[in-house]
Structures are given as structure tokens and as C-alpha cells.
Amino acid sequence: LSVQQGPNLLQVRQGSQATLVCQVDQATAWERLRVKWTKDGAILCQPYITNGSLSLGVCGPQGRLSWQAPSHLTLQLDPVSLNHSGAYVCWAAVEIPELEEAEGNITRLFVDPDDPTQNRNRIASFPG
């Protein structure tokens, strides 16, 4: 089982959309695949895929999950908020017929404020 995740780095504007893709491949067929997305180490969702369908379509706040055969698991964040910034990791495990697991590399998501001056204001108002 191998998992490839992309992109490595994603920078988007607040209020727009972010798409993270996880490609899950195995040389042999599988009956049930458990998938998991984490953000900064915390689990966002942990559905499974069987009979070509996801057991869950929601993944964390404003997150939608989809599976496109043969191998693409997509996490779409829409609309993106500032607290979506973080390190995302996709993990997958074949549960049936035999346990196999793998995880992707980190996708770092940076969310820019809708108003670019927000960053400067936040820094300027730092106490001291």
C-alpha cells in the first residue's frame, strides 16, 4: 500500500477554497479501506471506503471528502478560514483482506487574511 499526498505547500486566501489530494494505490484489490485526515496531529475524520463509496462525506469544519476511483481521495475545504492553517496528513489502511497501512507526506496549508492589512494590524497591536 502506498500513499502520495499533495500538494506539499498550499497558500490560499481566506474565504476561498483549498483542495488536498491523497492518492492511495495497492497492487492487489481491497475490500475495505480506512482513511484518515489529520491536522496538526488531531484527527479531522476517519471514514472507510467500501463498495466504491465513502462512509462519511464531512471532514472537519467546512471539509468535504470525496473518493474518485481508482485511487484519489480529496479533501476540499470551502470556505477556508484562518484557523484552517496547519499541517495536514492523509493516512490509509486496508482493513480487508489483510491489514496494510501507509501515510502521505505533510501538506502545509497557509491561509492569508482576506484583508492583507489584518496581519500588520495584528502585529502592530502586540502589547508592549
Partner: antibody, heavy 120, light 113 residues
Framework: QVQLQESGPGLVKPSQTLSLTCTVS??????????WSWIRQHPGKGLEWIGY???????YYNPSLKSRVTISVDTSKNQFSLKLSSVTAADTAVYYC????????????WGQGTLVTVSS | DIVMTQSPDSLAVSLGERATINCLSS????????????LNWYQQKPGQSPKLLIY???TRLSGVPDRFSGSGSGTDFTLTISSLQAEDVADYFC?????????FGDGTRLEIK
């Protein structure tokens, strides 16, 4: 260009252990998502999958041979090996090494094959 | 184990004519999860190692002449050579990778009539 080359003795005595090595060139066997495989072909017959070792080191063997087979990897030499114990004349065959990727599931590259005869 | 049954065992076809080789699996090789058939076809010329022709039942490997085509789904598969050339004389094998142990058909020997 990926190349695989089998090496080992062409004659093995009954009850002994058959040992073959496959040297891979043009590609690192530590690359993730690959299965390094052994397949054999009895004279004038079909192909039989013996087993493979995954990048992680996990092995998968044909149940019909499992009790006698060991596949291992030597990453420092970019090689993988087959050991088949307690051989009989029925193990006389051409032995091939090949690779398979998670992204494919087919044997993409094969060695040229080496004939191993089991005879006293 | 999944049993792969090939037919015919041997086949003699005139140059330029169509050759058809069948492969029947003992269980379905189609996955509803990946929407793929886990079936490959190989060609083996005398004294050589097998070479992949077709993967996922119907996808021709890059560089393989378009006279070779694969079809079928589930348990029934066919390899067709639309116009036989002299260099196509070989043994042909189907192989499943739906599950381990991976298994091959016994092969079909293709000759020129």
C-alpha cells in the same frame, strides 16, 4: 533503464537449499511502493508466482511454497534474494526475478531467467 | 486461490488474420472500489522472459502495437491480435493480481498456419 539480473548455481542436489540473487540496476530497491518478486517456470509449462518482498520488508509467499521459501533484501548491494529449502526434482525450473509497483500491479521488468536443475 | 483458465492451449493462425485468446477466472477480478479489472496479459517469445502487453484488462502498454487489444470484465477476458504478424509467434499468458497468491493462466501457444 531498470535492469534485473539473476545469479546463482544452476545445479542443486535434492534436499538442499536453492539460493538465488537478483541484482537491480538503474533503480533503487528502497524506493517506496515496490514489490520485488520471484516467479518460476517449469520446463514447457506456465508461470508460478513464488512470492515477493515489499519496500517495507514485509514478505508475501505463495501458500503452496510458504514453508520452504525465504525472500530477503540487501539494500547496500541493491539486491534481493530467494532461498528455497528441501528441494526436489519438481523444483527444476527457470527462475525469474521481477518488479511490481503498487501503482500498477503488473510485472514490469523481468530478469532474463536462470535455469536451476535439481539433480543428484 | 484464483484459478486462471486459458483457451485454447495452442492456436495456428494465418498471417494477417485475427487471433483470439480467452482467459476465464474462477472469481471476479473487478473491484467496485477502484473500478478496475485486475488482469494483465504477457507475451513470451522462445528463450525470452515474459513481457507485459496489456494491463487492467484493456490498457495497452506504451510501445505495444495497436493490433493487440484486451477486452472483458469480471471473469471473462480476451486478448485479440487483429492482424497476425510473424513476430507475434509466442506464448501468451493472462495473470490476475486481484489477490495473493498471484496466479497465471497455463498459456496459449500462438503459431503461424
Amino acid at each position: 533503464q531498470v535492469q534485473l539480473q539473476e545469479s546463482g548455481p544452476g545445479l542443486v542436489k535434492p534436499s538442499q537449499t536453492l539460493s538465488l540473487t537478483c541484482t537491480v540496476s538503474g533503480f533503487s530497491i528502497t524506493t517506496g511502493g515496490y514489490y520485488w518478486s520471484w516467479i518460476r517456470q517449469h520446463p514447457g509449462k506456465g508461470l508460478e508466482w513464488i512470492g515477493y518482498i515489499y519496500t517495507s520488508g514485509r514478505t508475501y509467499y505463495n501458500p503452496s511454497l510458504k514453508s520452504r521459501v525465504t525472500i530477503s533484501v540487501d539494500t547496500s548491494k541493491n539486491q534481493f534474494s530467494l532461498k528455497l529449502s528441501s528441494v526436489t526434482a519438481a523444483d527444476t525450473a527457470v527462475y525469474y526475478c521481477a518488479d511490481m509497483a503498487d501503482k500498477g500491479g503488473w510485472f514490469a521488468y523481468w530478469g532474463q531467467g536462470t535455469l536451476v536443475t535439481v539433480s543428484s | 486461490d484464483i484459478v486462471m483458465t486459458q483457451s485454447p492451449d495452442s492456436l495456428a493462425v494465418s498471417l494477417g488474420e485475427r487471433a483470439t485468446i480467452n482467459c476465464l477466472s474462477s472469481q471476479s477480478l473487478f473491484s467496485s472500489n477502484t473500478k478496475r479489472n485486475y488482469l494483465n496479459w504477457y507475451q513470451q517469445k522462445p528463450g525470452q522472459s515474459p513481457k507485459l502487453l496489456i494491463y487492467h484488462a484493456s490498457t495497452r502498454l506504451s510501445g505495444v502495437p495497436d493490433r493487440f487489444s484486451g477486452s472483458g470484465s469480471g471473469t471473462d477476458f480476451t486478448l485479440t491480435i487483429s492482424s497476425l504478424q510473424a513476430e507475434d509467434v509466442a506464448d501468451y499468458f493472462c495473470q490476475q493480481h486481484y489477490e495473493t497468491p498471484l496466479t497465471f493462466g497455463d498459456g496459449t501457444r500462438l503459431e503461424i498456419k
